[in-house]
């Protein structure tokens, strides 16, 4: 289409645009202090403020330091990008026992299953190894995931993991666990990024530039900024993000520079009257009868998750809102029915953790 490839003269006389010969298009000229998010920006929202290397632009439009993965027990999972922090995780052979924003405060070595136990779930960066008793007839010496993959049911004890103190320990002082020490270190060296690519090719901010003056051709970020808790709407106005401060609401998505915070009804409730980016009226889920099935999951979480039965088997027990509006979600897959006795139960949304009480009945974990 002609409008997709305008001639150079169509940009003349328009100081807010310039012609890019490489893409043969008119491009939007970002104001000083900001730079394009793409090769040929088309509108102010294609421009953004720039941060110095190793910083990212957070939702409140502030340059914020990316976390560092420099501790011996951490490796970089995702690099520092212009709009998101670097993310660190425990290095191979370790799992996170105390999480931190975009990182892990304390890593432990994965447990080695003791004699008579086999690996049910291998350890990950987030979870420790899960062990289970070896099936009858299986050799007690069978203690590695390679030799013992036979599924089994029963209790799931875990060996005590070995802690790594981020402040005082280094890789060389870790105790050897089951001969895996060298393998872990080798794997760590392979997966640790030798040099973070996050700052490569990112121009650093010139402190002499004023972010409010018109900027020279090809320079960047021109979009209007809003205060924290405000977003730039389609009309280019700073508009308040909705608030989820009501007791029956929880935040679904955060307030971003170009979109409002969105709220949804808290676990155990359903939206009866919707509102823009939120719910004007939440009502408790109704009591309804249904069969349930238990879904096995990683028992290291020490709880049991329950699933709704297959589609079509669930009775229709949605609340009828006063205004006749359909609830936000009526799909049977949106909620979990908890019923260890196959009696009347309360549906629980998937986001709510469900734990077994000492009586064996599931209880909603308030978290």
């Amino acid at each position: 289409f002609p409008q997709d490839r305008p001639f150079e003269d169509t940009c003349h006389g328009n100081p807010s645009h310039y012609y890019d010969k490489a893409v043969r298009r008119c491009c939007y000229r970002c104001p000083m202090g900001l730079f394009p998010t793409q090769q040929c920006p088309q509108r102010p929202t294609d421009c953004r403020k720039q941060c110095e290397p190793d910083y990212y632009l957070d939702e409140a439009d502030r340059c914020t330091a990316c976390v560092t993965c420099s501790r011996d027990d951490l490796v970089e999972k995702t690099p520092c990008a212009w709009n998101s922090s670097r993310v660190c995780e425990c290095r191979p052979g370790m799992f996170c026992s105390t999480s931190a924003v975009n990182s892990c405060a304390r890593c432990f070595f994965h447990s080695v299953c003791p004699a008579g136990m086999i690996v049910k779930f291998p350890g990950t960066a987030q979870k420790n190894t899960v062990c289970e008793p070896a099936s009858p007839g299986v050799s007690p010496a069978c203690a590695s995931p390679e030799n013992c993959k036979e599924p089994s049911s029963g209790t799931i004890p875990q060996a005590k993991p070995t802690p790594v103190s981020p402040a005082t320990s280094s890789a060389s002082t870790m105790p050897v666990r089951g001969g895996t020490r060298l393998a872990q270190e080798a794997a760590s060296k392979l997966t640790r990024a030798p040099d973070s690519p996050s700052s490569v090719g990112r121009p650093s901010s010139d402190p002499g530039l004023s972010p409010t003056q018109p900027c020279p051709e090809g320079s960047g970020d021109c979009r209007k900024q809003c205060e924290p808790d405000y977003y730039l709407d389609e009309a280019g106005r700073c508009t308040a993000c909705v608030s989820c401060s009501r007791d029956d609401l929880v935040e679904k998505t955060p307030c971003a520079w170009n979109s409002s915070r969105t709220c949804e009804c808290r676990p155990g409730m359903i939206c009866a009257t919707s509102a823009t980016n939120s719910c004007a009226r939440c009502v408790p889920y109704p009591i309804c009868a249904a069969e349930t099935v238990t879904k096995p999951q990683d028992m290291a979480e020490k709880d049991t998750t329950f699933e709704a039965p297959p589609l079509g088997t669930q009775p229709d027990c949605n609340p009828t809102p006063e205004n006749g509006e359909a609830p936000a979600s009526t799909s049977p897959t949106q909620s979990l029915l908890v019923d260890s006795q196959a009696s009347k139960t309360l549906p629980i949304p998937t986001s709510a953790p469900v734990a077994l009480s000492s009586t064996g009945k599931p209880v909603l974990d308030a978290g």
Epitope: K49, C226, R237, C238, A240, C241, V242, S243, S245, R261
Partner: antibody, heavy 121, light 106 residues
């Protein structure tokens, strides 16, 4: 918390620059707002500045009238009014929004004592 | 810009009476409305934020209510020290705008 400079007297067509010194909080955390109040009239928002970056935004009515700046080292925000006329003779306040808990928008619990500008030939 | 209209422009009350001040927005402002009290020769003081949240130290005789376009500030039992101008303001959409004020005389 916010201490504004003293009264200013200026001639028509001249400029004045008033200051607002912040104390008791991290100056760069909160954006500084400026508000005009004419005698017996309502409040009028002029604009704000992000002291951390120097980023400013103005009410369209004040784009050619006010210039906002901030000096992080002295924890002071400034507003310069140019091409003064009798319409500019009034009180100007610097103000700061409260914390975002509960997210109730830009509500202003902290105000300077005001700077009176008098434009007189 | 969103226009905030306050009524009445002024009112005279006796101590102990119930006072109701009105503020209307030209378009939906959700609950992003604040109320300010301004005594003669003083800076405005925040009374209510988020339409109904009483600010720290504000006496409980002051109550805010409303949402969308209609907002009310109520003084349940007016006192002599409540003599002041009262301003409402919205911060839902920039620029923030304020009403013309209501002068309360005791």
């Amino acid at each position: 918390l916010l201490h504004e400079s003293g009264a200013e007297v200026a001639k028509p067509g001249a400029s004045v620059k008033m200051s607002c010194k912040a104390s008791g909080y991290t100056f760069t955390t909160y954006w500084m707002h400026w508000i005009k109040q004419r005698p017996g009239q309502g409040l009028e928002w002029i604009g704000y500045i992000n002291p951390s970056t120097g980023y400013t935004d103005y009410n369209q009515n004040f784009k050619d009238k006010a210039t906002l700046t901030a000096d992080k080292s002295s924890r002071t925000a400034y507003m310069q009014l140019s091409s003064l006329t009798s319409e500019d003779s009034t009180v100007y306040y610097c103000t700061r929004r409260g914390p975002s808990y509960g997210n109730h928008g830009a509500w202003f619990p902290y105000w300077g004592q005001g700077t009176l500008v008098t434009v007189s030939a | 810009n969103i226009v905030m209209t306050q009524s009445p422009r002024s009112m005279s009350m006796s101590v102990g009476e119930r006072v109701t001040l009105s503020c209307k927005a030209s378009e939906n402002v959700d609950t992003y409305v604040s109320w300010y009290q301004q005594k003669p020769e003083q800076s405005p003081k925040l009374l209510i934020y988020g339409a109904s949240n009483r600010y720290t130290g504000v006496p409980d005789r002051f109550t805010g209510s409303g949402s969308a376009t209609d907002f009310t500030l109520t003084i349940s039992s007016v006192q002599a020290e409540d003599l002041a101008d009262y301003h409402c303001g919205q911060s839902y959409r920039y620029p923030p705008t304020f009403g013309g004020g209501t002068k309360l005389e005791i």
